[in-house]
Interface confidence: low
């Protein structure tokens, strides 16, 4: 239904608290360098204006689109060109081009310092003093670093943050209550961020159809008792929600997500038997819970997939009559039977099936041609299964840090031209897959591993797009999203790479490393490891292990020494010499 004032409609639907939070997220994601105070002022102005429109929808400018209203606000910021350079050129455009221009200027890797968490006492003090401002800061800091973060989900994480602080700030030992809980929220939020970025990449690069296919597969796995019409309806609604969020339409996105959650809870009987617990929760928790609800029990009497999609004589007719519907039905039927497969794998199988029908339906005897299609799926299924087994075995043997190092060596060999910080970040994230997925039951490992790796590799591609340096990476990133992970896995040592010359200063360390937190120490060591591989791309695992063990021993010795500085300055050069010899 059309509303006289879009902004009044959204304000009424969402309520002031969520409205303000979402406007703050929107502004922070568009203008990532502005301070919290600058954005908070804009948010207040927009909210005050929204209230005038609620009071009188015919008031001046209340009929304007949200893009127009928000864009005008952003373009009125003083010193826009000085702070944002060519982004200011967006302001010379009319809607919808202006919003598209803002979207294109979102920076996936803004040069902002890492979001440092204050110590517990300070955090609790500022939280107690002004919880609203405290949560505003959280939304701002996360949103500007993650310009595609799923906005309604960020409100959920802010709420989690709020609840943790409420609980822990009342405890005697605030630190030990807050740290593990906030670390948990941070970890979940970072995973949520890369997953959502992958969805937006899918939408931006391949359009709504590609995203809807992803949604059909995912929803069919989760709700195997829902019929195809129900899954299609849910996938269509979910596609709309994600399109809005990826497009910066955060108020519409949050509103539609709430509507979708409401619909699902009102139609549990035709969707899934597992929704009730989620549906009993308040809005933000409900929508979050529904997004990761456990798979419903599969119907016991499902016929073999071959009946309708291989053995039926009408296959080509059905395909010709409604290609998308027929392929969608195939994806639905295959996915609901395979909660143990990754969505990426299911989409590869659907793509293979489509290619087979394209080829075979043009032949004189199509059934003879497509009759073996299910057998042709086998290598496609085996490849990720082997990947999971090999990598989980390695993780169990080496632990998370050792596993990250193994991945770092592998990926530095595949793409040595990529910057060391990017390689280290990617390897650390890829290495977390072990902790996240390898401990799960067998039937949950593959979907967990492959869909997580795909999301991390999407970030690698986004960072590489800004400064392309590796043909290997360009090749894998320019293909379809579902082929990326197999493409990266298949890469071998880049033979075109000219090794970096050995620079002693790259491997020179000082006593300040001793006081760093464990995570930062690991990053320093992993940086050195990547540089070693760039110097000797064909070094054996044994050689690299020798050097890294020597390095770890050196750090241990010097960090325990009475005179650390002297130890580092005398033993450091010896270490460098030994490294050169070991790799010679």
């Amino acid at each position: 239904e059309a509303h006289k004032s879009e902004i009044a409609h959204r304000y009424n639907d969402l309520g002031e608290q969520h409205f303000k939070g979402l406007v703050l997220i929107a502004f922070s994601q568009y203008l990532q360098k502005c301070s919290y105070d600058e954005h908070a002022k804009l948010v207040q102005e927009v909210t005050d204006f929204a209230k005038t429109c609620v009071a009188d929808e015919s008031a001046a400018n209340c009929d304007k689109s949200l893009h127009t209203l928000f864009g005008d606000k952003l373009c009125a910021i003083p010193n826009l060109r000085e702070n944002y350079g060519e982004l200011a050129d967006c302001c010379t455009k009319q809607e919808p081009e202006r919003n598209e221009c803002f979207l294109q200027h979102k920076d996936d890797n803004p040069s902002l310092p890492p979001f440092e968490r204050p110590e517990a006492e300070a955090m609790c003090t500022s939280f107690k003093e002004n919880p609203t401002t405290f949560m505003g800061h959280y939304l701002h800091e996360v949103a500007r670093r993650h310009p595609y973060f799923y906005a309604p989900e960020l409100l959920y994480y802010a709420e989690q943050y709020n609840e943790i602080l409420t609980q822990c700030c009342a405890e005697a030992d605030k630190e030990s209550c807050l740290t593990p809980k906030l670390d948990g929220v941070k970890e979940k939020a970072l995973v949520s961020s890369v997953r959502q970025r992958m969805k937006c990449s899918s939408m931006q690069k391949f359009g709504e159809r590609a995203f809807k296919a992803w949604a059909v597969a995912r929803l069919s796995q989760t709700f195997p008792n829902a019929d195809f019409a129900e899954i299609t309806k849910l996938a269509t609604d979910l596609t709309k929600v994600n399109k809005e969020c990826c497009h910066g339409d955060l108020l519409e996105c949050a509103d539609d997500r709430a509507e979708l959650a409401k619909y699902m809870c009102e139609n549990q009987a035709t969707i899934s038997s597992k929704l009730q617990t989620c549906c009993d929760k308040p809005l933000l928790k409900k929508a979050h819970c529904l997004s990761e609800v456990e798979h419903d029990t599969m119907p016991a009497d499902l016929p073999a997939i071959a009946a309708d999609f291989v053995e039926d004589q009408e296959v080509c007719k059905n395909y010709a009559e409604a290609k998308d519907v027929f392929l969608g039905t195939f994806l639905y039927e295959y996915s609901r039977r395979h909660p143990d497969y990754s969505v990426s794998l299911l989409l590869r199988l659907a793509k293979k099936y489509e290619a087979t029908l394209e080829k075979c339906c043009a032949e004189a005897n199509p059934p003879a041609c497509y009759g073996t299609v299910l057998a042709e799926f086998q290598p496609l299924v085996e490849e990720p299964k082997n990947l999971v087994k090999t990598n989980c075995d390695l993780y169990e043997k080496l632990g998370e840090y050792g596993f990250q190092n193994a991945i770092l060596v592998r990926y530095t060999q595949k793409a040595p031209q990529v910057s060391t910080p990017t390689l280290v970040e990617a390897a650390r994230n890829l290495g977390r897959v072990g902790t996240k997925c390898c401990t799960l039951p067998e039937d949950q490992r593959l979907p967990c591993v492959e869909d997580y790796l795909s999301a991390i590799l999407n970030r690698v591609c986004l960072l590489h797009e800004k400064t392309p340096v590796s043909e290997h990476v360009t090749k894998c990133c320019s293909g379809s999203l579902v082929e990326r992970r197999p493409c990266f896995s298949a890469l071998t040592v880049d033979e075109t790479y000219v090794p970096k010359e050995f620079k002693a200063e790259t491997f020179t360390f000082h006593s300040d490393i001793c006081t760093l937190p464990e995570k930062e120490k690991q990053i320093k060591k992993q940086t050195a490891l990547a540089e070693l591989v760039k110097h000797k791309p064909k070094a054996t695992a044994e050689q690299l292990k020798t050097v890294m063990d020597d390095f770890a021993q050196f750090l241990d010795t010097c960090c325990k020494a009475a005179d650390k500085d002297t130890c580092f300055s005398t033993e450091g050069p010896n270490l460098v010499t030994r490294c050169k010899d070991a790799l010679a």
Partner: nanobody
Framework: KVQLLESGGGLVQPGGSLRLSCAAS????????MSWVRQAPGKGLEWVSS????????LYADSVRGRFTISRDNSKNTLYLQMNSLRPEDTAVYYC????????SSQGTLVTVSS
């Protein structure tokens, strides 16, 4: 376990008054800012008012400023909302929340303003 229990709602004529209470337990009440939020039938949640832990600072939505007064009694672990000059548009379920929470976790109390 943190618990909040609202009371004091009811049916009142336009222009009338009501005083809502919220009994809190399971946490150090005086150490936390508290808020009232409301949800009108078929609408989204709306923030109404907030108060600091000590009670010295208060905030109000424009729609209630001058008519509603938030207060607290830390010795009784109770939050209050005095509502005067009530209007039909104040009809809603009212919830108290801790620390500016974005959504309520309690049952709320229904306020109906009607002649």
């Amino acid at each position: 376990k943190v618990q909040l229990l609202e009371s004091g709602g009811g049916l009142v004529q336009p222009g009338g008054s009501l005083r809502l209470s919220c009994a809190a337990s399971g946490f150090t009440f005086s150490s936390f800012g508290m808020s009232w939020v409301r949800q009108a039938p078929g609408k989204g949640l709306e923030w109404v008012s907030s108060i600091s832990g000590s009670g010295s600072d208060t905030l109000y939505a424009d729609s209630v400023r001058g008519r509603f007064t938030i207060s607290r009694d830390n010795s009784k672990n109770t939050l209050y909302l005095q509502m005067n000059s009530l209007r039909p548009e104040d009809t809603a379920v009212y919830y108290c929340t801790i620390g500016g929470s974005l959504s309520p976790s309690s049952q709320g109390t229904l306020v109906t303003v009607s002649s």
